[in-house]
Each structure stands twice: as structure tokens, then as C-alpha cells.
Amino acid sequence: PRSIEVKYIGVKSAYVSYDAEKRTIYLNITNTLNITNNNYYSVEVENITAQVQFSKTVIGKARLNNITNIGPLDMKQIDYTVPTVIAEEMSYMYDFCTLLSIKVHNIVLMMQVTVTTAYFGHSEQISQERYQYVDCGRNTTYQLAQSEYLNVLQPQQ
């Protein structure tokens, strides 16, 4: 069998909401993956499991099942959304993310994704992880892979 390639493209969008009383941030992060099937036969994408970490703490998980079938020598782009919650011991981030006076509230998140593919009864898992900048202060739609290159703006006094 030839390889199945998984390429994490980046964050497509991040939609933010807050709970002021709980000092909690809710971020719905949509990511984009390219999965390439270099084989001369179809491959089933059984599931995608993803998790997001902030400061070494898992803040969100997602799992997609029975996703798609990728034909021979074909490539499919798949979007998946991970709902994340920044709260409790990280509630100090609420102050930063809700600062009106800061234009871009970028935080560094680690995106981890594992794609499980199947062909002829055989399963294969391919994992990727990437650090990404995400704006926790406003709803943002990113250009393809743009989020990789943003600078982190720390609050200055």
C-alpha cells in the first residue's frame, strides 16, 4: 500500500463567546485538514479525533465518525470543529481576552489531530500536532493557513 497523507492546514475560523459571571471563554475552533490517498484503491476515513491544549491543559476535544471515502489518487479537504472552554484555573485569561483596548487577543493553542483510515480491513492512524495563534477576543475567519503566521500580542502597560 502507498501512503495516506494527512496535512493540517490551519484554523479556518474561531467563534468566541463569554460567560461574565463564570469568567469563562468559549471558543468554537474550526480547523481544516487535507487528506490525500496515494493508493490505487479507495480508502475510508473512519474517524477524526482532535483535541486542543492551552498551556498544557486540554481545553477541548472532538470526534467525527464515518466521515468520508477518498477515491484512488484523490484528495479531500475536511473541516472539523472543536468546542473549547477556557475556565477555572485559566480564568485569568478572561481579563486578557475581553480587553476592549487590545486589537488582537492572540493566544497560543496546540492543535492535535489523529485520523484513522481503513482499507481492506486494515486500519491506520496518522497524527499531527501544531501550535496555532487564535484570537480569543472576537470572531475571526482566517485566510487559508494565515493563522500560522500571526504574532502573539501580549498586553502591555
Epitope: 459571571e21 475581553t98 480587553l99 476592549l100 483596548s101 486589537k103 498586553p155 502591555q156
Partner: antibody
Framework: QVQLQQSGAELVKPGASVKISCKGS????????MNWVKQRPGKGLEWIGQ????????NYNGKFKGKATLTADKSSTTAYIHLSSLTSEDSAVYFC????????????WGQGTSVTVSS | DVVMTQTPLSLPVSLGDQASISCRSS???????????LHWYVQKPGQSPKLLIY???NRFSGVPDRFSGSGSGTDFTLKISRVEAEDLGVYFC?????????FGGGTKLESK
Amino acid sequence: QVQLQQSGAELVKPGASVKISCKGSGYAFSSYWMNWVKQRPGKGLEWIGQIYPGDGDTNYNGKFKGKATLTADKSSTTAYIHLSSLTSEDSAVYFCARWGHYDEAMDDWGQGTSVTVSS
Amino acid sequence: DVVMTQTPLSLPVSLGDQASISCRSSQSLVHSNGKTYLHWYVQKPGQSPKLLIYKISNRFSGVPDRFSGSGSGTDFTLKISRVEAEDLGVYFCSQITHVPWTFGGGTKLESK
């Protein structure tokens, strides 16, 4: 320390225009919104609008749209306000003020520039 | 626009007295993020305004603890526990919760 140095007083004729400058130093100029505030003699304060020097983004008080134009030059760390079609109502002291990140208030102000409109 | 109403317009005090200035807004100043953006400034003759209190009750750096702010929603108060000569000037409340940002008309704190 943060300093905002404004240009000197202006005496202009009605119908003319004027451009006031505000040079910021001692902080990351591009990353802070710069606000402009008007104060007429013996009167209160009026917020004109703000500019983000990093990308030139602006927010205006509707009352001053068409009257004031805000610009900024990152290379010289200077913000500008251009006031057009001046009348006696525009005679005032104009302040620039930085919007602080932590306190989320206008925590540093320029010394003010007096504009007098008179024929 | 949000109207900020300050009272009194003028406040004559004896040095050492307590002074209290009220500020009312025409609508709630609680932002959707839960914060209330009500600030207090003081302006002395011939000078630019200076930040005194931010977000209702937080003293700005270098501001003496005789200054305190309180309130919520639409009603706010600035108190000076023992007025000193250097405190005389015009005090303004200001809101930045809603655009356009607006200021109160000012309260002149003066010596009796």
C-alpha cells in the same frame, strides 16, 4: 515613560483646515489606540474618535464624521487629526490620549493644542 | 448617545472635608463582557485631564487612597475622604461601554 507631545497652537480663518500632530514615545505606539478629545473654553469634554496606528483602523463619533479625519504614521510614531471647513464652533483645545491596555481608560494625555478660528 | 449627568456642578469644600460627586448614565454601563467601563478624570486649570479611577473603583497608579469610586449599572459616586489643596479642580466621569464615548459635564471642586 509614556509621553504624548502635541503640536503648537493654531490661529486659522473660517473655512480653512488644520492638522494637529501628536507624537507618542516610551511605548509600543502601533499597538495602542490613540483617541482625540475636544474641549471648548469653559465646556466639557467631547470624544472625537480613535485610530489604531498598527493598521489605520478608525472609530468616529458620528458628530465629527466629515469634520475630523484621523491618521497615523507608524514610522514617526505620530498621530494626526485633520479638521476641515472650520467655524467658530471648532475653536477649542484638542487633546490626544492613549487608550491603556490594562486599565482600559485614557491613561496618558497630550498637553493639548489650542485651535482658534477667527477672521 | 449615552448621557452622563454629574451633580453637583460646583462643590465648595473646606480642606479636610469629605467630598462626594455623583454621576448617572442614561443607560446601563455594563458591557456584554460583564465589565463596567466608568472612569473618573480630574483636570486642573491649564492642564490636560488625568486618569483618577478606572472601571468604577480602581485607583490609577499614583492616585492616593483618599480617592474611592463606587456604584453599578447607571449610578456612580466618586468620594474624596479628606480634601487637600492639590485636589481642587474639575472632575469628569466618562463611559466607554457604548460608542460614542461620552463624558459628564464636570464638577468643579473648589475651596470654600
